[in-house]
Amino acid sequence: DGCKDIFMKNEILSASQPFAFNCTFPPITSGEVSVTWYKNSSKIPVSKIIQSRIHQDETWILFLPMEWGDSGVYQCVIKGRDSCHRIHVNLTVFEKHWCDTSIGGLPNLSDEYKQILHLGKDDSLTCHLHFPKSCVLGPIKWYKDCNEIKGERFTVLETRLLVSNVSAEDRGNYACQAILTHSGKQYEVLNGITVSITERAGYGGSVPKIIYPKNHSIEVQLGTTLIVDCNVTDTKDNTNLRCWRVNNTLVDDYYDESKRIREGVETHVSFREHNLYTVNITFLEVKMEDYGLPFMCHAGVSTAYIILQLPAPDFRAY
């Protein structure tokens, strides 16, 4: 069918509740394109009827709500004027919520479900709610260890829970809950978050600092080889992982077949109070599809990206 396959290997873990996934693949989806969702290689597209439990909403696939049998691989096909890309998304549904039972709960939590608060500081937790514009989210309630959070130290501000003067007792299992309204029907969204407290006040606390990149673009010619370093400072006793990701997938996994873009071997230099880590990303040959795509360097909870950009035309040559 002439479509280029892109495999997003990351599993998205979700409880039985509303769930949405947006089919975006810059720079492809930034132009005039049509997006169509399919399930498990079916030839029949996902319904666009808003009354359907599973339906396509613009570029999103929306589950109202997601059910046990919805696990599987979904494809979104992005067709441009002279291009076609098929993105594969693996969704796994987990039926139970932690506050109801520990059985059949979410294993191997992704980073979105892990957050850090800083001891003695004013800090915040974020409730990740990703839904299309057709979904209206009500005010968010927050729970800790399965009881609603109340008290002067806690303030709810939009999708965040502000915590003043963080103490060691603030570690634990949190959940944020919102009522989602879609076409007059209401659904409950409940996201679990495991919260740890960082107690070290050494070199810049224990949050890694990404020195480079700095969320910027790099001009690079088509077809060239490019190596970009990610430089990170962190405490000597840190346990943070450092890696490059694209579309929330490790680059080595994302380009598993072609091996055109690879992550390098991490090196570090030890200083008296901290370590300086370097891990690079190598583009053996820059292709059109690389432009406009954020390549993310992750270091623990810290992230920074580069975006490749075609050099501006040099009019002096004409």
Epitope: D100, S102, I103, G104, G105, P107, D145, C146, E169, G172
Partner: antibody
Framework: QVQLQQTGSVLVRPGTSVKLSCKAS????????MHWAKQRPGQGLEWIGE????????NYNEKFKGKATLTVDTFSSTAYVDLSSLASEDSAVYYC????????????WGQGTLVTVSA | QIVLTQSPTIMSASPGERVTMTCSAS???????LHWYQQKPGSSPKLWIY???NLASGVPARFSGSGSGTSYSLTINSMEAEDAATYYC?????????FGAGTKLGLK
């Protein structure tokens, strides 16, 4: 470090009840589910049920409903199982075990309490 | 409920021998929820392998786990005296939680 300290061995009469304890230390007691399991001498393990210390929510194996009651005391970080109408088939080692969020397995176990039901 | 059947029930192996024991589930279990525990006489069970193939802290690298769906296995690539114990598989997918009856591994 994480410890689950259980009651020593107990000898009880048939028809009576016994309350076994599991005192938790080294972690936030209210953040994890506590489970109980039974193991008869020379036999395998049977799951009794689970309790969330902060909400006191319980889930039981149907087989143990009416036989076992799970409770907690958050002030002393202690979980309890109350076994009623004891009979010889209730003679067993009873274990408490903890389950953490995002880790659905028994990473920590108590040392077990041997209950002997005998006239 | 999900019934877990372990085989063999009893086995023995010489030092250095490769050992494999299996755990068969009556219905499909996600690999995330299938675990193995080691138990020695007079002791409580110890988490040995979690989520099918991940070794718990302190477990020697000679142990490995594999499988999917209804068929799982635990392998010791070179038996040592300290490995003599009973091994239980367990599912954490659905209530009631269930354990296999165990495989008792002895030293020849």
């Amino acid at each position: 470090q994480v410890q689950l300290q259980q009651t020593g061995s107990v000898l009880v009469r048939p028809g009576t009840s016994v309350k076994l304890s599991c005192k938790a230390s080294g972690y936030t007691f209210t953040s994890s589910w506590m489970h109980w399991a039974k193991q008869r001498p020379g036999q395998g393990l049977e799951w009794i049920g689970e309790i969330h210390p902060n909400s006191a929510k319980t889930n039981y194996n149907e087989k143990f409903k009416g036989k076992a009651t799970l409770t907690v005391d958050t002030f002393s970080s202690t979980a309890y199982v109350d076994l009623s109408s004891l009979a010889s088939e209730d003679s067993a080692v009873y274990y408490c075990a903890r389950v953490d969020y995002g880790k659905p397995w028994f990473a920590y176990w108590g040392q077990g309490t041997l209950v002997t039901v005998s006239a | 409920q999900i019934v877990l059947t372990q085989s063999p029930t009893i086995m023995s192996a010489s030092p250095g021998e490769r050992v494999t024991m299996t755990c068969s589930a009556s219905s499909s279990v996600s690999s995330s929820y299938l675990h193995w525990y080691q138990q020695k006489p007079g002791s409580s069970p110890k988490l040995w392998i979690y989520s099918t193939s991940n070794l718990a802290s302190g477990v020697p690298a000679r142990f490995s786990g594999s499988g999917s769906g209804t068929s799982y296995s635990l392998t010791i690539n070179s038996m040592e005296a300290e490995d003599a114990a009973t091994y239980y598989c367990q599912q954490f997918q659905s209530s009631p939680l269930t354990f296999g009856a165990g495989t008792k591994l002895g030293l020849k």
